[in-house]
């Protein structure tokens, strides 16, 4: 029986009965917030073999092992994850072992096992046999392994029953509990699963099977399940659903899920039955079950009940995220804010059409309107008094409307009004008239030539770069010395630069009047020698990175014909040289035979150029005789090993309080002070733990149902 669409068992342990007939949970399984310690021994769900999303256990008092509850849970598919995790075991106060001895595969996602004070048998499980990549697993804050003394079956009797694998250079027995080994398939099966008797399953099986080489005997399917058979792809007229099974069109048409209730129903796209058309596609008609590609960004119509939407904060802008057509009027009134330009672009950057008017007033935080980076049409179906559909009043720091070289904006109906925008040049407004097709609509007083641009350098000359030199982390540039009509007006230059992967940045990107600016700024004094060209060395740059650079002349606010003269350069794009890449990440090695090592790694976080190949070096090490000196199977005689990393147990410090130079050969020594990098890593780790815990609490604490 398939159970779904996600099962949440909380408060009352008897709700576990809901799992009685489930073989597959299509969705997640939450077992949480059961504060009264119960006896779970009478609860056993041997039918449950697959969870298609994730398993979350949180604060279940009295539960000591999962093995009795779910003895046959074989696969957690991770089709949807809980904060990147397919298995989360968090704050399980009484859990002593995981015990999921039939768990063979976590198809997607990692595991997070944290703050389980009594939990052992963690180091005896080889998660690499279950997951593709173990590097994202997070196993922290559980019972210290030293206090566990985990012993696999038969070890005490010196008749070990479990198989060995290598984890972190430690070759050891692998088990789930004191009497359950971790199952491993013969190497002859390769990536295939196997039966309890070690016979290889059909290639389409995942986890296990009841008979060898039979696609109808799989416990779970590697790809898709249809009519009792595991298939590599869904047959004709059936569609992939929830990442694991094939359904017909009728099933897909009839789905009414809590998650999709507001939508127009599920769609069939690219052989899959899904909740919505994927990114870049739209329904082929409002009630269609099929998707077609969007031309440009997919339309999303947003409507304001009160006709006029006031944007006075990031929060109000957030409501417009993803909107491409706004039915109504926009009133923008941003007086202050942090990182406002990029936040507004994030939430309003997709708007293409406004059906009413756009009014920008008292928005002293704005330097540019480029955050409306896709606005192409103002219909002006509703207009302000005086028939204005674009109204810009009293914006003390507004310097740019849009980059008119790369912008097509049409105002279909209505006039424009501009007043009291002291840094907005009238030439910029006139340019907008031409582009938008409103030229001739405005009357004389609609664009005030005296109080717009009165405090801006509106007649700009162009500065030209004369030379550029690059190294791996430096750029040297020089430019022509600017000579204003009166040389005393020139004070200095300001160089603006930033990383620019693409050649599409503008001067006003990410800039607002409250100090946020995506550009780095450096002041450059005039060279005392009038014949020397000004220049600068930009250092501390990243290797093999493209930067955008431009220069502005800083001039006295000399007014000439009512306007200030100024000068600035075009934006120059320049790439630093390549350099040595950082080290490859997550290097793991394991032996799969007596004469082979398998080494895996992830690419470096900073390639610093185009990677062409890796060099792998290895050398033989002498065997550590220390390993043979003790009987590790004897539970009481595990020696405390002295690691050569400078850290020791507190007990040992009290015995021998002498301090030695770190790294010395003379015995115990103090821990070396943490490096800045280590401190930073610890800080990030603590932050990450908090973020996860907040996510957990926000996800699971919900209002009580009626």
């Amino acid at each position: 029986e398939i159970c779904g669409p996600g099962i949440d068992i909380r408060n009352d342990y008897q709700q576990l009965k809901r799992l009685e007939n489930c073989t597959v949970i299509e969705g997640y399984l939450h077992i949480l917030l059961i504060s009264k310690a119960e006896d779970y021994r009478s609860y056993r769900f041997p039918k449950l073999t697959v969870i298609t999303e994730y398993l979350l256990l949180f604060r279940v008092a009295g539960l000591e092992s999962l093995g009795d509850l779910f003895p046959n849970l074989t696969v957690i598919r991770g089709w949807k994850l809980f904060y990147n995790y397919a298995l989360v075991i968090f704050e399980m106060t009484n859990l002593k072992d995981i015990g999921l001895y039939n768990l063979r595969n976590i198809t997607r996602g990692a595991i997070r096992i944290e703050k389980n004070a009594d939990l052992c048998y963690l180091s005896t499980v080889d998660w690499s046999l279950i997951l593709d990549a173990v590097s994202n697993n997070y196993i922290v804050g559980n019972k210290p392994p030293k206090e566990c003394g985990d012993l696999c079956p038969g070890t005490m009797e010196e008749k070990p029953m479990c198989e060995k694998t290598t984890i972190n250079n430690e070759y050891n027995y692998r088990c789930w509990t004191t009497n359950r080994c971790q199952k491993m398939c013969p190497s002859t099966c390769g990536k295939r699963a196997c039966t309890e008797n070690n016979e290889c399953c059909h290639p389409e099986c995942l986890g296990s099977c009841s008979a060898p080489d039979n696609d109808t005997a799989c416990v779970a399917c590697r790809h898709y399940y249809y009519a009792g058979v595991c298939v590599p792809a869904c047959p004709p007229n059936t569609y992939r659903f929830e990442g694991w099974r094939c359904v017909d069109r009728d099933f897909c048409a009839n789905i009414l899920s809590a998650e999709s209730s507001d939508s127009e129903g599920f769609v069939i796209h690219d052989g899959e039955c899904m909740q919505e058309c994927p990114s870049g596609f739209i329904r082929n008609g409002s009630q269609s079950m099929y998707c077609i590609p969007c031309e440009g960004p997919c339309p999303k119509v947003c409507e304001e009940e009160k006709k006029t939407k006031t944007i006075d904060s990031v929060t109000s802008a957030q409501m417009l995220q993803g909107c491409t057509i706004f039915k109504g009027n926009l009133l923008i009134n941003i007086r202050r804010g942090n990182n406002i330009a990029s936040e507004l672009e994030n939430f309003m950057g997709l708007i293409e059409v406004v059906t009413g008017y756009v009014k920008i007033r008292h928005s002293h935080a704005l330097v540019s309107l480029s955050f409306l980076k896709n606005l192409r049409l103002i219909l002006g179906e509703e207009q302000l008094e005086g028939n204005y559909s674009f109204y810009v009043l009293d914006n003390q720091n507004l310097q740019q409307l849009w980059d008119w070289d790369h912008r097509n904006l049409t105002i279909k109906a209505g006039k424009m009004y501009f007043a009291f925008n002291p840094k907005l040049c009238v030439s910029e407004i006139y340019r907008m008239e031409e582009v938008t097709g409103t030229k001739g609509r405005q009357s004389k007083g609609d664009i005030n030539t005296r109080n717009n641009g009165e405090r801006a350098s509106c007649e700009s000359d162009v500065l030209h770069f004369t030379s550029t030199t690059t190294s791996k982390n430096r750029i040297i540039i020089t430019w022509h010395r600017y000579r204003p009509p009166d040389y005393r007006d020139l004070i200095s230059f300001t160089v603006y630069y930033k990383e620019a992967p693409f050649k599409n940045v503008t001067e006003y990107d990410g800039q607002d009047a409250c100090g946020s600016n995506s550009w780095n700024m450096v002041d450059v004094d005039l060279p005392p020698n009038k014949d020397v060209e000004p220049g600068i060395l930009l250092h501390g740059l990243k290797p093999w990175t493209q930067y955008a650079v431009y220069v502005k002349a800083v001039t006295l606010t000399m007014v000439e014909n009512d306007h200030i003269r100024g000068a600035k350069s075009e934006i120059l794009y320049i790439r630093t040289n390549a350099s040595v890449p950082s080290i490859p990440l997550d290097v793991l090695s394991a032996s799969n035979s007596s004469s082979q090592l398998i080494v895996k790694w992830n690419p470096p976080s900073l390639p610093n150029g185009n990677l062409s190949y890796y060099i792998v070096r290895w050398q033989r090490q002498p065997q550590d005789g220390y390993l043979y000196r003790h009987n590790y199977c004897s539970k009481d005689k595990i020696p405390i090993r002295k690691y050569a990393d400078g850290t020791i147990d507190i007990e040992e410090v009290t015995e021998n309080p002498k301090t030695e130079v770190c790294g010395g050969e003379k015995g115990p020594c103090c821990a070396c002070p943490k490096t800045e990098a280590e401190k930073q890593a610890e800080k990030e780790e603590a932050e990450y733990r908090k973020v996860f815990e907040n996510f957990l609490h926000n996800s699971i604490f919900v209002p009580r149902p009626e």
Epitope: I2, C3, P5, I7, F251, A253, N254, L256, S261, E264
Partner: antibody, heavy 117, light 112 residues
Framework: QVQLQESGPGLVKPSETLSLTCTVS?????????WNWIRQPPGKGLEWIGY???????NYKPSLKDRVTISRDTSKNQFSLKLSSVTAADTAVYYC??????????WGQGTLVTVSS | DIVMTQSPLSLPVTPGEPASISCRSH???????????LQWYLQKPGQSPQLLIY???NRLYGVPDRFSGSGSGTDFTLKISRVEAEDVGVYYC?????????FGQGTKVEIK
């Protein structure tokens, strides 16, 4: 894989309240769909009574609205029908059924309720 | 309530012959979203109803192609191109476009 099972007394006295429960297995009633009651008097046609939705809102047949209540117990994954002031005309086979976005896809096997003194 | 009227109420048929059932509503059952939620169900003796056709003309996966649905607005028809013995039972039309949902009175199909 989704199963619905009606349960309740087979005999109810006139003027009393008829109470039936539908136990759902294989799907959480809060996860989606509309959970309906439909009845069929002996030898007659089907009559839709009403539903409770996955988020707990109700819709009833107007002519029964004053007498009918459909509620749910999410912890047991059950929904219930209560029909008050019953008469012989309420004698019928009562079905619970799941309705999706378009149609009824799963039905219980039905339970006969007789109203008689 | 929208009343769904079926005709005939009884339909004796010969195996291999075609059959047709009509269902009329006294007002349009087109939903505001443009869809017409008109279904046809078959109830075999002693069983719960089972779906045959949804949204006027969509045959449910697994239903034999001798069944077809058609119509629009207020007039709808279920056709069986060649009746087989297993097709006996009561056929109901049902509308789910507007609450309250309603069934037709049913058409009993039996073999002559």
């Amino acid at each position: 894989q989704v199963q619905l099972q009606e349960s309740g007394p087979g005999l109810v006295k006139p003027s009393e309240t008829l109470s039936l429960t539908c136990t759902v297995s294989g799907y959480s009633i809060t996860g989606g769909y509309l959970w309906n009651w439909i009845r069929q008097p002996p030898g007659k046609g089907l009559e839709w009574i009403g539903y409770i939705s996955y988020h707990g809102t109700n819709n009833y047949k107007p002519s029964l609205k004053d007498r009918v209540t459909i509620s749910r117990d999410t912890s047991k994954n059950q929904f219930s029908l209560k029909l008050s002031s019953v008469t012989a005309a309420d004698t019928a086979v009562y079905y619970c059924a799941r309705h999706g976005r378009v149609f009824f896809d799963y039905w219980g096997q039905g339970t006969l309720v007789t109203v008689s003194s | 309530d929208i009343v769904m009227t079926q005709s005939p109420l009884s339909l004796p048929v010969t195996p291999g012959e075609p059959a047709s059932i009509s269902c009329r509503s006294h007002q349009s059952i087109v939903h505001s979203n443009g869809n017409t939620y008109l279904q046809w169900y078959l109830q075999k003796p002693g069983q719960s109803p089972q779906l045959l056709i949804y949204k006027v003309s969509n045959r449910l996966y697994g239903v034999p192609d001798r069944f077809s649905g058609s119509g629009s607005g207020t007039d709808f028809t279920l056709k069986i191109s060649r009746v087989e013995a297993e097709d006996v039972g009561v056929y109901y039309c049902f509308h789910g476009s507007h609450v309250p949902w309603t069934f037709g009175q049913g058409t009993k199909v039996e073999i002559k």
